[in-house]
């Protein structure tokens, strides 16, 4: 909501999840794993690379299946706590200027730092209006303090916010799952928020330097090397 | 149960108001987008308009634009909707119906929406 | 505005037959559709929804599939109760939410 669309394959490491349609965004972190939300779990699922339009074949895209989809232990469905979800492709996807991994953080998201969030989802806070050209915004990433007063009781330590207090710039339905990038690195996930776009009602995201430690060993756990004694 | 109970059928002249309510039970009212649906004699549905019943934002439909009014009172968990300056084509049936998209906490996955629910309808005559 | 087209009009089937409804968008509306039912003097009731899923309570008889602009009911074995008339609705580009025309399945 109140985005712009991206230039052309600019965000290169933005997947959509499909299953039949786009349903969820994703972020992807090496040549055959994406993360993405939690909540966008279903038992299969095509992940699309080097998506722009959507709706149109463009000849960048990279259309894999999923082989594994693997969801934090700890995920919450009623507080959307650990709202983490990873994807192992069934096959490597090819790496190219327009499909390319994004780099995990190497320190905790910093208010006032700003960031891209990326999606297919809705652009109106009232209604709806699903795009099929990705959609950008630029949002800074707001205090622990006043993501805490917006949403009193409901912010773990693995969520964060960003966007604008006065509202009218937000990611929306659709965009779940997908990338809050800063720096060059995958800061936040697409999660939850109340409406879309609200006054006092910012974007809450998962904070993905909480999970590095569970990314890199489920990762290491689902990767087939095999030892010979 | 989960039910939406609308007000008794009206007759009005051309020219007059009506108002219609539509009163949630069963759920938390305020969770859920209240759209009012109205049909001719004979004819299909035709959407109206939506209200938020969380913040009483509403969308309306052009052709009702400056004719119709969606309101709530959500202390008695009820959604109103008025239309006016009355003429003998708004002789219709008209429903209210929700939207099960949680307005509160609302994860950013893709939401199917439907008119899981419908109110009973209310026939409105519009004669002279 | 998003056009909703149903065809055919009415449709004449046979109990027991299988009945297929078409409902068919001017523009891409992803997979956000219904479809409900509607009896005369009755207001309608949801069947399907998003393009494919069962509504709470609906029988396994009636199926939902298509995505983007063609869109397909199926009702695989016609009971005397499922003789009303359908409407598809679209929920991908609001407002205003459009529905089709409604497609009336008669006892043949």
């Known amino acids: 909501v109140g985005g712009y669309i991206c230039e052309e394959n600019s965000v290169p490491y933005q997947v959509s999840l499909n299953s039949g349609y786009h349903f969820c965004g994703g972020s992807l972190i090496s040549e055959q794993w994406v993360v993405s939300a939690g909540h966008c779990y279903k038992s299969r699922i095509q992940v699309r690379l080097g998506e722009h339009n959507i709706e149109v074949l463009e000849g960048n895209e990279q259309f894999i299946n999923a082989a594994k989809i693997i969801r934090h232990p700890k995920y919450n469905s009623r507080t959307l706590d650990n709202d983490i979800l990873l994807i192992k492709l069934s096959s490597p996807a090819v790496i190219n200027s327009r499909v390319s991994a994004i780099s995990l953080p190497t320190a905790p998201p910093a208010a006032g730092t700003e960031s891209l969030i990326s999606g297919w989802g809705n652009t109106l806070s009232s209604g709806a209006d699903y795009p099929d050209e990705l959609q950008c915004l630029d949002a800074p990433v707001l205090s622990q303090a006043e993501c805490e007063a917006s949403y009193p009781g409901k912010i773990t330590n693995n969520m964060f916010c960003v966007g604008f207090l006065e509202g009218g710039k937000d990611s929306c339905q659709g965009d779940a799952g997908g990338p809050v990038v800063s720096n060059g690195e995958l800061q936040g996930i697409v999660s939850w928020g109340y409406g879309c776009a609200q006054k006092n009602r910012p974007g809450v995201y998962t904070k993905v330097y909480n999970y590095v430690d569970w990314i890199k060993d489920t990762i290491a756990a689902n990767s087939h090397h095999h030892h010979h004694h | 149960q989960v039910q939406l109970v609308q007000s008794g059928a009206e007759v009005k002249k051309p020219g007059a108001s009506v108002k219609v309510s539509c009163k949630a039970s069963?759920?938390?009212?305020?969770?859920?987008?209240m759209h009012w649906v109205r049909q001719a004699p004979g004819q299909g549905l035709e959407w109206m308009g939506s209200?938020?019943?969380?913040?009483?934002?509403?969308n309306y439909a052009q052709k009702f634009q400056g004719r119709v009014t969606m309101t709530r009172d959500t202390s008695i968990s009820t959604a109103y909707m008025e239309l006016s300056r009355l003429r003998s084509d708004d002789t219709a049936v008209y429903y209210c119906?929700?939207?099960?998209?949680?307005?509160?906490?609302?994860?950013?996955?893709?939401?199917?929406?439907?008119?899981?629910?419908w109110g009973q309808g209310t026939t409105v005559t519009v004669s002279s | 505005e998003i056009v909703m087209t149903q065809s055919p009009a009415t449709l004449s089937v046979s109990p027991g037959e299988r009945a297929t409804l078409s409902c068919r968008a001017s523009q891409s509306v992803g997979s956000n559709l219904a479809w409900y039912q509607q009896k005369p003097g009755q207001a309608p009731r949801l069947l399907i929804y998003g393009a494919s899923t069962r509504a709470t309570g609906i029988p396994a008889r009636f199926s939902g599939s298509g995505s983007g602009t063609e869109f397909t009911l199926t009702i695989s074995s016609l009971q005397s109760e499922d003789f009303a008339v359908y409407y598809c609705?679209?929920?991908?580009?609001?407002?205003?939410?459009?529905f089709g025309g409604g497609t009336k399945v008669e006892i043949k």
């Open positions: 069963g759920y938390t009212f305020t969770g859920y987008y």
């Open positions: 609705q679209q929920f991908h580009n609001w407002p205003p939410l459009t």
């Open positions: 209200i938020n019943p969380s913040s009483g934002g509403t």
């Open positions: 119906a929700r939207d099960p998209v949680l307005l509160l906490r609302q994860q950013r996955i893709l939401h199917e929406s439907a008119f899981d629910i």
